[in-house]
């Protein structure tokens, strides 16, 4: 499973509003939804290998 909570900033432009914690921006419907509804990477314990290396999250990502 690659689902799990991740606090992402909102993607609803032109003036992006941050999603609240535990919500993620759904690019396909253009609004914030519960992160568990999207297949986002589950944060791993320190030292655990990740299925895909992720760049640091950028603002509004």
């Amino acid at each position: 499973m690659r689902r799990g909570p991740r606090s992402l900033r909102g993607r609803d432009a032109p003036a992006p509003t941050p999603c609240v914690p535990a919500e993620c921006f759904d690019l396909l419907v253009a609004h914030c939804v519960a992160c568990g509804l999207l297949r986002t990477p589950r944060p791993k314990p320190a030292g655990a290998s990740s299925p895909a290396p992720r760049t640091a999250l950028q603002p509004q990502e």
């Epitope: 689902r3 992006p16 993620c24 509804l37 999207l38 297949r39």
Partner: antibody, heavy 118, light 113 residues
């Protein structure tokens, strides 16, 4: 690991309905977007549509009203139906899962070749 | 829909050579959030497509560093610094900025010269 597997008939007659199943293991289809993509002879990839975590659907307008994507959450499967097929629908059909952070297709089925011929 | 134009359609190379594939989009792929959702996939013979590069320049897990992606706006490039036999196949660019529908380039077949 998430795995997807397409199944269904490899030969369909013109004017009939193409029906495929995508079986998902390692993740729940009640999370994310689950997609159908096809590849024509000659390498063209066409995005067909999705069914979402909520059960909402999107269909590529190029397929008009011929396409239907449904799901059975109890079986963790989703389905493609393409009505009134012609030889132009001969293609390899893939189901794929969508990463919800960077929005790429991170997991694909092996694909199934469907030939439309009488 | 966004049209993705890939060149060349066929790319004959010698092993060890550098290869370069271009992808151009009919509109800028910079999303209003500032991100550019341009990805590259490789489909090896008999396999399904596999992600190589996401968001223009980020290598996916397990992808060798001889693969690199660059570009911005509407013009993007995938480079392979030293082609190996296992790199042969069809390369596709794809955009997830203006979706749905997701759209793909026409594909570039990398083959041995």
């Amino acid at each position: 690991d998430v795995q997807l597997q397409e199944s269904g008939p490899s030969l369909v007659k013109p004017s009939q309905t193409l029906s495929l199943t995508c079986s998902v293991t390692g993740d729940s289809i009640t999370s994310g977007y689950w997609n159908w993509i096809r590849k024509f002879p000659g390498n063209k990839l066409e995005y067909m549509g999705y069914i979402s975590y909520s059960g909402s659907t999107y269909y590529n307008p190029s397929l008009k009203s011929r396409i239907s994507i449904t799901r059975d959450t109890s079986k963790n499967q989703f389905y493609l139906q393409l009505l009134s097929v012609t030889t132009e629908d001969t293609a390899t059909y893939y189901c794929a899962g969508l990463d919800g952070l960077y929005w790429y297709f991170d997991v694909w089925g092996a694909g199934t070749l469907v030939t439309v011929s009488s | 829909d966004i049209v993705m134009t890939q060149t060349p359609l066929s790319l004959p190379v010698s092993l060890g050579d550098q290869a370069s594939i271009s992808c151009r989009s009919s509109q800028s792929l910079v999303h209003s959030n500032g991100n550019t959702y341009l990805h590259w996939y490789l489909q090896k013979p008999g396999q399904s497509p596999k992600l190589l590069i996401y968001k223009v320049s980020n290598r996916f897990s397990g992808v060798p560093d001889r693969f690199s992606g660059s570009g911005s706006g509407t013009d993007f490039t995938l480079k392979i610094s030293r082609v190996e036999a296992e790199d042969l196949g069809v390369y596709f660019c794809s955009q997830s900025t203006h979706v749905p529908p997701f759209t793909f380039g026409s594909g570039t077949k990398l083959e041995i010269k």
